[in-house]
């Protein structure tokens, strides 16, 4: 059986401030069993953005029903984007255990934030 791959199809995504950003991630197998986590950045200072298993992430929602056992789509939507959200986001598969251990990471999606479009009212 082929080893699970974590696929982040978009190398980059650009979103206007105040909008929502959709970050796509799918896995190619249900094995090994274990949760998905999303991080911003890499290395020791990487920031946890979403943990499928636990935690409170008020601006993040899953695009599909990620709790369904057969689900292989772990895309997320981040609401009310601000310039502080810019960065590279990684979808990471963990292997179930005590504790769960990192199994494989996606290649990352770079999120850039455009200025909110200004609305000019023209008076005639």
């Amino acid at each position: 059986e082929e080893e699970l791959q974590v696929i982040q199809p978009d190398k980059s995504v650009s979103v206007a401030a105040g909008e929502s950003a959709i970050l796509h991630c799918t896995v190619t197998s249900l094995i090994p069993v274990g949760p998905i986590q999303w991080f911003r950045g890499a290395g020791p200072a990487r920031e946890l953005i979403y943990n499928q298993k636990e935690g409170h992430f008020p601006r993040v929602t899953t695009v599909s029903e990620s709790t369904k056992r057969e689900n292989m789509d772990f895309s997320i939507s981040i609401s009310n984007i601000t310039p502080a959200d810019a960065g590279t986001y990684y979808c990471v598969k963990f292997r179930k255990g005590s504790p769960d251990t990192e199994f494989k990471s996606g290649a990352g999606t770079e999120l850039s934030v455009r200025a909110k479009p200004s609305h000019h009212h023209h008076h005639h």
């Epitope: 020791p44 200072a45 990487r46 920031e47 251990t101």
Partner: antibody
Framework: EVQLVQSGAEVVKPGASVKLSCKAS????????MHWVKQAPGQGLEWIGA????????TYNQKFKGKATLTVDKSASTAYMELSSLRSEDTAVYYC???????????????WGQGTLVTVSS | DIQMTQSPSSLSASVGDRVTITCRAS??????LNWLQQKPGKAPKRLIY???SLDSGVPSRFSGSGSGTEFTLTISSLQPEDFATYYC?????????FGGGTKVEIK
Amino acid sequence: EVQLVQSGAEVVKPGASVKLSCKASGSTFTSYWMHWVKQAPGQGLEWIGAIYPVNSDTTYNQKFKGKATLTVDKSASTAYMELSSLRSEDTAVYYCTRSFYYSLDAAWFVYWGQGTLVTVSS
Amino acid sequence: DIQMTQSPSSLSASVGDRVTITCRASQDIGSRLNWLQQKPGKAPKRLIYATSSLDSGVPSRFSGSGSGTEFTLTISSLQPEDFATYYCLQYASSPFTFGGGTKVEIK
């Protein structure tokens, strides 16, 4: 109780290399980044780099690239730092310390090894 | 790299004194700052993480405050066991950097 136990003091000749070890016990080794910190005699603390045992991912302070090489042996729950082409300015105490696999505030640099003194002398 | 400028580099104080040590970051690090205490011949010991959260077992006379680029460690009433060197450390981005240290000596 979490413990980081480092190897003993080393006296090495200029130009030689030395490999220091840091053995972790009391918690899951792979869930943490292992960091190394230098303290020259009478000086402050300098971060050298860190390694993530799950996949041996490393990150280095540019200043120590080419000087320090970080490795791990997961089966032995041990991290290693090899220092090469040693010079007198590499004389220092080297500490290992750790942080969680993501940037959980409470897990940054709370546990430290006792330090290993490396003396470079001809 | 983020530079951490700590002041003063040393100070003399008496038991019971209130002591304040400051750390300035060269760019915004949010609240991602630790304060460490080190005694001669020993490994550093973390006192405070995330700017103001006290580690377990650390006396309440130690407190931390600040955010962004300006941070403070305060010892409200200095005790004999507090004479040591104190370092700030930013862990917002790699390479992680320490302040130069503040040596607190007996007056």
